[in-house]
Interface confidence: medium
């Protein structure tokens, strides 16, 4: 019996297919062949289906980089890992996705989902559109949507100081942010760590975090592979 | 244009009530937080509540925590402010004000207000 | 909650005049400030948005600056229109609190 989905365009399509163990995938943009991406599926959370673009969990990676670095990705999709607004772009393209955000702390966990997710094109400095919030760590996003992409060397903010090199990190900050999972690790001083403002404050940097995409239509997608 | 209009105010006995509302027009309602902020006179400004557009998400100063509800009604563009067990120090000038788009804490647009005096 | 402490309280200036009225935040609050201006009798008006953004139709002689605990509004040359009380206000966090305002008046 062949695929359903030959050329997987995310890790919902993957699971379509019957794969329902989360891990590295190839997915291929538009459905394109030439275009190959090699991504982590999140195959559990929240019926699975979820390509993971953020992770951090030990301070390994070091996630103070430039705007070319953050543009392409960098990091293991196993550990710690950015996988690059590049290719979040050209995923966000394909169909309307949701973002889901997932935090851990000592035994403690909190969730953000917003059903409309897009990031721009490198001509908009890869706008961040984010809508439709449900979940238990608080709505922190909100406050970055329609914000384009700062790092260091490239300060997109609304600030007179440039946030990213002010919080040692990169985010579409505006000035300067409630949501800075890209900081520094571990880092408690105000607003310098990995932070949710709107779950541990500013003062506090999270242990564990991951971003993650998928189609906003997955629920009925799945639904049908299941009657057929 | 963007406006908002207050009505409902008055003078009122301490211990009674009173229910604020405010009309919005020229944009779209659920999108943006809303809130009140009252100055009492001759005083400073000082935020009372707030609202999520959505409305699932309300806020209070403690100065009013338990006494006041704040309210939406998208379907009629409107804002409310229920006010019990009302005290002489309630006594203001309540504004309605429209959060900018985002988190919504920062008020781009306010109505003219509309006066609560609490007396006996 | 967030203290806001704002001086002076009075500033009697010359019309043409700098002004410069500064607001102290208890708390750091990175730049979730914002500025207003208020006409007796009337509404506040928002003139500065996180800390040093120009709200729409608000003259250039206008600016903010400052982050952390630290913020300042200029006004660089002072107009008759411009005599008016000054609040600065933190978004930072809820409640969202006020300075007790600037009176500037006539010297």
């Known amino acids: 019996i062949g695929l359903l989905y030959p050329f997987p365009r995310d890790c919902s399509q993957a699971m379509l297919n019957g794969d329902t163990t989360s891990g590295l995938y190839t997915i291929y943009i538009n459905g394109d062949k030439t275009q190959a991406l090699e991504v982590y599926c999140d195959m559990t959370s929240d019926g699975g289906g979820w390509i993971v673009f953020l992770r951090r969990k030990n301070g390994r990676e070091d996630f103070y980089r430039n705007w070319k670095a953050y543009a392409a990705g960098f990091g293991d999709r196993r550990e710690e890992f950015w996988l690059g607004l590049d290719n979040l772009s050209k995923i966000t393209a394909q169909g309307q996705y949701e973002l889901r955000v997932d935090l851990q702390d000592h035994g403690e966990s909190a969730y953000a989902v917003y059903d409309r997710f897009s990031v721009g094109d490198a001509k908009s400095r890869y706008k961040l559109k984010v809508e439709g919030y449900s979940g238990t760590a608080g709505d922190s996003m909100n406050y970055h949507n329609g914000r384009s992409f700062s790092t260091y060397d490239k300060d997109t903010d609304s600030a007179i100081t440039n946030c990213a090199l002010s919080y040692k990190g990169a985010f579409w900050y505006k000035n300067c942010h409630r949501v800075n999972l890209m900081g520094r690790y571990g880092d408690n001083n105000h607003s310098q760590g990995v932070n949710w403002f709107h779950w541990k404050g500013h003062e506090y940097s999270i242990q564990f975090a991951e971003m993650k995409l998928r189609p906003s239509n997955f629920r009925n997608l799945e639904g049908r592979r299941k009657r057929a | 244009q963007v406006q908002l209009v207050e009505s409902g105010g008055g003078l009122v006995q301490p211990g009674r009530s009173l229910r604020l509302s405010c009309a919005a027009s020229g944009f779209t309602f659920d999108d943006y937080a809303m809130h009140w902020v009252r100055q009492a006179p001759g005083k400073g400004l000082e935020w009372v509540s707030g609202?999520?557009?959505?409305?699932?998400?309300?806020y209070y100063a403690d100065s009013v925590k338990g006494r006041f509800t704040i309210s939406r009604d998208n379907a009629k563009n409107s804002l409310y402010l229920q006010m019990n067990s009302l005290r002489a120090e309630d006594t203001a000038l309540y504004y309605c004000a429209k959060g900018q788009k985002g988190e919504g804490d920062t008020f781009d647009i306010w109505g003219q207000g509309t006066m609560v005096t609490v007396s006996s | 909650d967030i203290q806001m402490t704002q001086s002076p309280a009075s500033l009697p200036t010359p019309v043409g005049d700098r002004v410069t009225i500064t607001c102290r935040a208890s708390?750091?609050?990175?730049?979730?400030l914002n500025w207003y201006q208020q006409k007796p009798g009337k509404a506040p008006k928002l003139l500065i948005y996180d800390a040093s953004n120009l709200e729409t139709g608000v003259p250039s002689r206008f600016s903010g600056s400052g982050s952390g605990t630290d913020f300042t509004l200029t006004i660089s040359s002072l107009q008759p229109e411009d005599f008016a009380t000054y609040y600065c206000q933190q978004s930072y966090s809820t409640p969202q609190t006020f300075g007790q305002g600037t009176k500037v008046d006539i010297k």
């Open positions: 609202i999520s557009g959505s409305g699932g998400s309300t």
């Open positions: 708390q750091y609050i990175q730049g979730f």
